[in-house]
């Protein structure tokens, strides 16, 4: 019987949380808290919004974003795209991994102009050491941050 | 090569399902089926709606609730909050872990007053032995139970 | 200390992606891409839309489907059911595992033509060797396929 090679190693895992600095408005990915509160990194690293893989393998990656607004003003995108994207040194552009499109404005009712919606993504992808995963939301102006529990980003090796 | 300490132990996991008794109307957390049908506990225990951790570590915790209604009568909350909360002996109040807010009433259309919506939460959190995780939904009157497949609560160690 | 039996084995995992052939219109389950792009099978097999278990155990199974449409006319399904179902040699009918009902047409506003919605399911279930899991969506006409990132189906042993 061959002893398991993962034996004494920790299984890579991370959970990053939304913070006031998450939304940059720069067209870049969302940024995340990595240490305070519920946030942690174990066997993964972080760089400018990205979870960086240090050990190759299959990972369940996930993200949730809390969306909200008041009414549906003209000029605001009627479709929200929330996605997890891979950056790899082997290719110049980000690669879509898991994506959702939603029309949250339809949540507003005649009696209540305030609406809330949530988008969750999760799935298993193969990641090589050095590859990065980021979260993007278009239009990010509709993302509602509060205390790190409503918008987050994480992964663990399976 | 150091042999893995988890070697002969089972990896803690649980999946609890919604039942007629889940909604108490008491302001407490949702209650769950732990044994019948698809429900099980393996290396975790259960107490009054809570998954109780017996082995410290990082856990992917998740919950889905099925929401539904007929129209959107005034007096019924236009915002639903669905969350996973931690109870710890070290702190008197529940701690928010993962939370979603939704406005499901916006699902009703002019032609169909009946609406359905679903809320899913999942993420990795660190839990100590003896700590508990519960699910709360406000307003729980909109939770639609049936056969344990539409509303559920689970966890597994990562 | 007993060495772990999983030692040198890979942990079963799979991620299958939506493709043009996914929607058959035959009343059967959705079909999936198993090899190209992000899709893979590791320690699980595939047959006619089903993930087939080769090693008994507890699995976290998940699926996301992207829904979309133009307007919400009467006659178009007002309720969408998205579910994961088990097929077992021990029982003639499919067994519901995880199910969501949504009313995505409520996403359309009076002025906004196009609506998008997404449904995510995930949970831990016990599966025996030879058992199968499939995804069904009713009404599947509203499922929007594109590039395998918006509708998918996967599992991994926990």
């Amino acid at each position: 019987l061959i002893q398991e090679r993962r034996s004494h190693e920790v299984n890579p895992a991370a959970h990053l949380t939304g913070a006031n600095s998450s939304l940059t408005g720069s067209g870049g990915p969302l940024l995340w808290e990595t240490q305070l509160g519920l946030a942690f990194l174990r066997g993964l690293s972080y760089h400018d919004g990205a979870l960086v893989v240090t050990k190759a393998g299959y990972y369940y990656i996930y993200s949730k974003v809390q969306l909200g607004g008041v009414g549906c003003p003209l000029g605001l995108a009627s479709t929200i795209t929330h996605g997890l994207y891979k950056r790899t040194p082997r290719y110049p552009e980000e690669l879509e991994l898991l994506v959702s499109q939603q029309s949250p404005c339809g949540r507003a009712t005649s009696s209540s102009r305030v609406w809330w919606d949530s988008s969750f993504l999760g799935g298993v992808v193969h990641l090589e050491a050095g590859e990065e995963v980021v979260v993007r939301v278009l239009d990010e102006r509709l993302v509602r941050l509060r205390d790190g529990t409503r918008s987050y980003f994480g992964a663990f090796m399976v | 090569l150091i042999q893995e300490r988890r070697s002969h132990e089972v990896n803690p996991a649980a999946h609890l399902t919604g039942a007629n008794s889940s909604l108490t109307g008491s302001g407490g957390p949702l209650l769950w089926e732990t044994q019948l049908g698809l429900a099980f506990l393996r290396g975790l225990s259960y107490h009054d709606g809570a998954l109780v951790v017996t082995k410290a570590g990082y856990y992917y915790i998740y919950s889905k609730v099925q929401l539904g209604g007929v129209g959107c009568p005034l007096g019924l909350a236009s915002t639903i909050t669905h969350g996973l909360y931690k109870r710890t002996p070290r702190y008197p109040e529940e701690l928010e872990l993962l939370v979603s807010q939704q406005s499901p009433c916006g699902r009703a259309t002019s032609s169909s007053r009946v609406w359905w919506d679903s809320s899913f939460l999942g993420g990795v959190v660190h839990l100590e032995a003896g700590e508990e995780v519960v699910v709360r939904v406000l307003d729980e009157r909109l939770v639609r139970l049936r056969d344990g497949t539409r509303s559920y609560f689970g966890a597994f160690m990562v | 200390l007993i060495q772990e039996r999983r030692s040198h084995e890979v942990n079963p995992a799979a991620h299958l992606t939506g493709a043009n052939s996914s929607l058959t219109g035959s009343g059967g389950p959705l079909l999936w891409e198993t090899q190209l792009g992000l899709a893979f099978l590791r320690g699980l097999s595939y047959h006619d839309g089903a993930l087939v278990v080769t090693k008994a155990g507890y699995y976290y199974i998940y699926s996301k489907v992207q829904l979309g449409g133009v307007g919400c006319p009467l006659g178009l399904a007002s309720t969408i059911t998205h579910g994961l179902y088990k097929r077992t040699p021990r029982y003639p009918e499919e067994l519901e595992l995880l199910v969501s009902q949504q009313s995505p047409c409520g996403r359309a506003t009076s002025s906004s033509r196009v609506w998008w919605d997404s449904s995510f399911l995930g949970g831990v279930v016990h599966l025996e060797a030879g058992e199968e899991v499939v995804v069904r969506v009713l009404d599947e006409r509203l499922v929007r396929l594109r590039d395998g990132t918006r509708s998918y189906f996967g599992a991994f042993m926990v």
Partner: antibody, heavy 122, light 107 residues
Framework: QVQLQESGPGLVKPSGTLSLTCAVS?????????WNWVRQPPGKGLEWIGE???????NCNPSLKSRVTISVDKSKNQFSLKMNSVTAADTAVYYC???????????????WGQGTTVTVSS | DIQMTQSPSSLSASVGDRVSITCQAS??????LNWYQQKPGKAPKLLIY???NLETGVPSRFSGSGSGTDFTFTISSLQPEDIATYYC?????????FGGGTKVEIK
């Protein structure tokens, strides 16, 4: 493949009612497509009038809504346009056209009739 | 209503030239934009849907790009049979609205 054919009077008196029918052939009006009316005044651009689904659900241009009725007859595989209180400004070529599927997310008007000229004059 | 502003309103180019037409929406319409060709005395014909997708059977010299509020329609190499008026149309919001059209002629 699907073909559309408009029919109706070519001349309508002011304040009268314009009535047009569009016959669908080569396919069923009970598909998930929306069925549209578009018009084009002489020498001008295109204006959307409205649409109907086989179940009877309709949407109309707000600028015309008070005067327009769109209906469907599934037994005859056709849909119709009625516009009342017409004036010379309603003189145009009227097209029926198939829109995108309700169970779809693009809305190209991909099949058109050849158009019928309606003149409003006494 | 969403206003669709097309420019130029007319253009003249030589056979083989690259021709571009722009369409600007008065608000963000994502990629919910189509392009049509209308030859004199004929019904419009759908060429491009969802801003950049070529309708089946349409020659590859036609293309579209853009998202949000600014869109471009291009004929990579103008052919004599391309003489027509071209219209953009949005379907993000009701009512569906068209641009004013661009008349393309051969020099």
């Amino acid at each position: 493949q699907v073909q559309l054919q408009e029919s109706g009077p070519g001349l309508v008196k002011p304040s009268g009612t314009l009535s047009l029918t569009c016959a669908v052939s080569g396919g069923s009006i009970s598909s998930t497509h929306w069925w549209n009316w578009v018009r084009q005044p002489p020498g001008k651009g295109l204006e959307w009038i409205g649409e109907i689904y086989h179940s009877g659900s309709t949407n109309c241009n707000p600028s015309l809504k008070s005067r327009v009725t769109i209906s469907v007859d599934k037994s005859k595989n056709q849909f119709s346009l009625k516009m009342n209180s017409v004036t010379a400004a309603d003189t145009a070529v009227y097209y029926c056209t198939r829109g995108g599927a309700a169970a779809g997310t693009n809305y190209g008007l991909d099949v058109w009739g050849q158009g019928t000229t309606v003149t409003v004059s006494s | 209503d969403i206003q669709m502003t097309q420019s130029p309103s007319s253009l003249s180019a030589s056979v083989g030239d690259r021709v571009s037409i722009t369409c600007q929406a008065s608000q963000d319409i994502s990629n919910y934009l189509n392009w049509y060709q209308q030859k004199p005395g004929k019904a419009p014909k759908l060429l491009i849907y969802d801003a950049s997708n070529l309708e089946t059977g349409v020659p590859s010299r036609f293309s579209g790009s853009g998202s949000g509020t600014d869109f471009t329609f291009t004929i990579s190499s103008l052919q004599p049979e391309d003489i027509a008026t071209y219209y953009c149309q949005q379907y993000d919001n009701l009512p569906l609205t068209f641009g004013g059209g661009t008349k393309v002629e051969i020099k």
